[in-house]
């Protein structure tokens, strides 16, 4: 028995082959024997049953010369899985179509970190097909009926190519995944004390109308709980702030990519934020991290300090030295100081291995003045 | 081409109420957020109001905050400005102003209505 | 409100001449900037939006810049016709806010 796969929706072509290689008599049957369509001498097609039953069957009259009489089904139904037998030359073939249905749940339009489950559908106990699913820059997928994709990154957005395999025999289909997200999970901003501050969200899609609601928490590192800094609403892409706080005097942009500024970085803002945006007709929400890391030098009586606050790795390095010379202190910490510093201009620098995420200078005039 | 014609101008009392009317041509109205901007004599250009192309979000300028009220009428091409409580420091031509559809620039301006509060 | 200030408040001079007039604002705005000139008795027209973009129609002497919230207008070389009264308005929200303006007069 040959097998012929099809999918829901779209055409299969049942073969049905001559020995001779020329044009014969053949009928193609359900295996309750009703006639589906024949050709009985004359080089006609003649149909069975009324024309609307059977108008979705059709053969291809031109390979008929050379010995091949296939059964076209067009626009397949679920129903059509079943056995259809080829009468010619005194033999019957028979040939098994397997008509598979493929549902995206939640659907191909998702958010990022949301999961998609591909699930094949038949009325036919067939055992089990291997579906995968490759995308264009190589990433492959595979399962058996049900095919699942965990955590979806923006960048599995895009068309992906799918073969379902059932004894040797295969069927593609494709399917194109729209997945919505931040084009960074999570940034960080460095700056020095009193400087200004500005935090961009940027989407990694553009959709003509954009529709939804946000707020902004922020967990201060020198605070005992997070605080809501901002609620905001997206009308066709215009952004309108429902509700801010008054310290920090936040700022937020109107238009796309969402955008927030804070007039002053000041040590009591440093920390970790969360950006949650909520848009409609879509469960769950998008979530991007921001984090503000402040640095402050100061000179208080007799000593030079260098702080910096906020979200650093174990493996950032701050260094306090006077300019153009040698490092005084270099310490994996969040503070360095220097006790009775000598007169002239000092530098602050925070590192992570050569690279240097931010510097901070101070003009210390004598020792024992206060001087910021 | 698109055009705005401001109207609804004139004289008025202080604590009087006037409807100023900027009617649109030329353009799908509710696709651009619109803007009222005023210029009192001889001084600088002040912006006083914006709707949203959706005309559900509403902005006001803290000098007019609850006596100004923008609305606009999608299936005239209007906009409108009712003033209440007026006074005399609201004395100013007034210019209907469309921004563009992904910028938030004014690109097309009316040539201005003049109000003027006096006793 | 985001604060747009200014400067010069008032300027002369001379055909030919280059022109440079900055804004600053009271917090950062992206580029959410843009120059518009005014000649009495008539409505304000767009030169630059955007911090730099030339608006269609506007002569290729008008220029514009971003330096973190400070914004520059460029006129590289004065023509007759450009003897105005110069506003920068910040559209990045709401309340807008334009500065005080700079007339520029021949000198």
């Known amino acids: 028995k040959t097998l012929v796969l099809g999918k829901e929706g779209e055409s299969a072509e049942l073969p049905c082959e001559s020995s001779q290689k020329k044009i014969t008599v053949f009928t193609w049957k359900f295996s309750d024997q009703r006639k589906i369509l024949g050709q009985h001498g004359k080089g006609v097609l003649i149909r069975g049953g009324s024309p609307s039953q059977f108008d979705r069957f059709d053969s291809k009259k031109g390979a008929w010369e050379k010995g091949s009489f296939p059964l076209i089904i067009n626009k397949l139904k679920m129903e059509d899985s079943q056995t259809y037998i080829c009468e010619l030359e005194n033999r019957k073939e028979e040939v098994e179509l397997w008509v598979f249905k493929v549902t995206f749940s939640p659907g191909t339009s998702l958010l990022q970190g949301q999961s998609l489950t591909l699930t094949l559908d038949s009325n036919s106990k067939v055992s089990n097909p291997l579906t995968e699913c490759k995308h264009k820059k190589g990433k492959v997928v595979s399962g058996s009926k049900v095919l699942s994709m965990s955590n979806l990154r923006v960048q599995d957005s895009d068309f992906w190519n799918c073969t379902v395999t059932l004894d040797q025999k295969k069927n593609w289909f494709g399917m194109t995944l729209s997945v919505l997200g931040f084009q960074k999970a999570s940034s960080i901003v460095y700056k020095k004390e009193g400087e200004q501050v500005e935090f961009s969200f940027p989407l990694a899609f553009t959709v003509e109308k954009l529709t939804g609601s946000g707020e902004l928490w922020w967990q201060a590192e020198r605070a005992s709980s997070s605080k809501s800094w901002i609620t905001f609403d997206l009308k066709n892409k215009e952004v309108s702030v429902k509700r801010v706080t008054q310290d920090p005097k936040l700022q937020m942009g109107k238009k796309l990519p969402l955008h927030l500024t804070l007039p002053q970085a000041l040590p009591q803002y440093a920390g970790s934020g969360n950006l949650t945006l909520a848009l409609e007709a879509k469960t769950g929400k998008l979530h991007q991290e921001v984090n503000l890391v402040v640095m402050k030098v100061a000179q208080l009586n007799n000593t030079l300090t260098c702080e910096v606050m906020g979200p650093t790795s174990p493996k950032m390095r701050l260094t306090l030295k006077q300019e153009n010379q040698e490092a005084r202190v270099s310490e994996e910490q969040k503070v360095v100081q220097v006790v009775a510093p000598e007169t002239g201009l000092w530098q602050c620098l925070l590192s992570e291995g050569d690279k240097v995420k931010m510097d901070s200078r101070i003009q210390v005039l004598s020792r024992g003045v206060n001087q910021t | 081409e698109v055009e705005l014609l401001e109207s609804g101008g004139g004289l008025v009392q202080p604590g009087g109420s006037l409807r100023l009317s900027c009617a649109a041509s030329g353009l799908t109205f509710s696709t651009f957020a619109m803007s009222w901007v005023r210029q009192a004599p001889g001084k600088g250009l002040e912006w006083v109001s914006g709707i949203s192309g959706s005309g559900e979000n509403t902005y006001y300028a803290d000098s007019v905050k609850g006596r100004f009220t923008i609305t606009s009428d999608n299936s005239k091409n209007t906009l409108y400005l009712q003033m209440n409580s007026l006074r005399a420091e609201d004395t100013a031509v007034y210019y209907c102003a469309k921004e563009g559809y992904n910028w938030n620039y004014m690109d097309v301006w009316g040539k201005g209505t003049t109000v003027t509060v006096s006793s | 409100a985001i604060q747009m200030t200014q400067s010069p408040s008032s300027l002369s001079a001379s055909v030919g001449d280059r022109v440079t007039i900055t804004c600053r604002a009271s917090h950062g705005i992206r580029n959410d900037l843009g120059w518009y000139q005014q000649k009495p008795g008539k409505a304000p027209k767009v030169l630059i939006y955007?911090?730099?973009s030339l608006q269609s129609g506007v002569p290729s002497r008008f220029s514009g810049s971003r330096s973190g919230t400070d914004f520059t207008l460029t006129i590289s070389s004065l023509q007759p016709e450009d003897f105005a009264t110069y506003y920068c308005l910040q559209d990045y929200t709401y309340p807008y806010t334009f500065g005080q303006g700079t007339k520029l007069e021949i000198k």
């Open positions: 955007e911090a730099s």
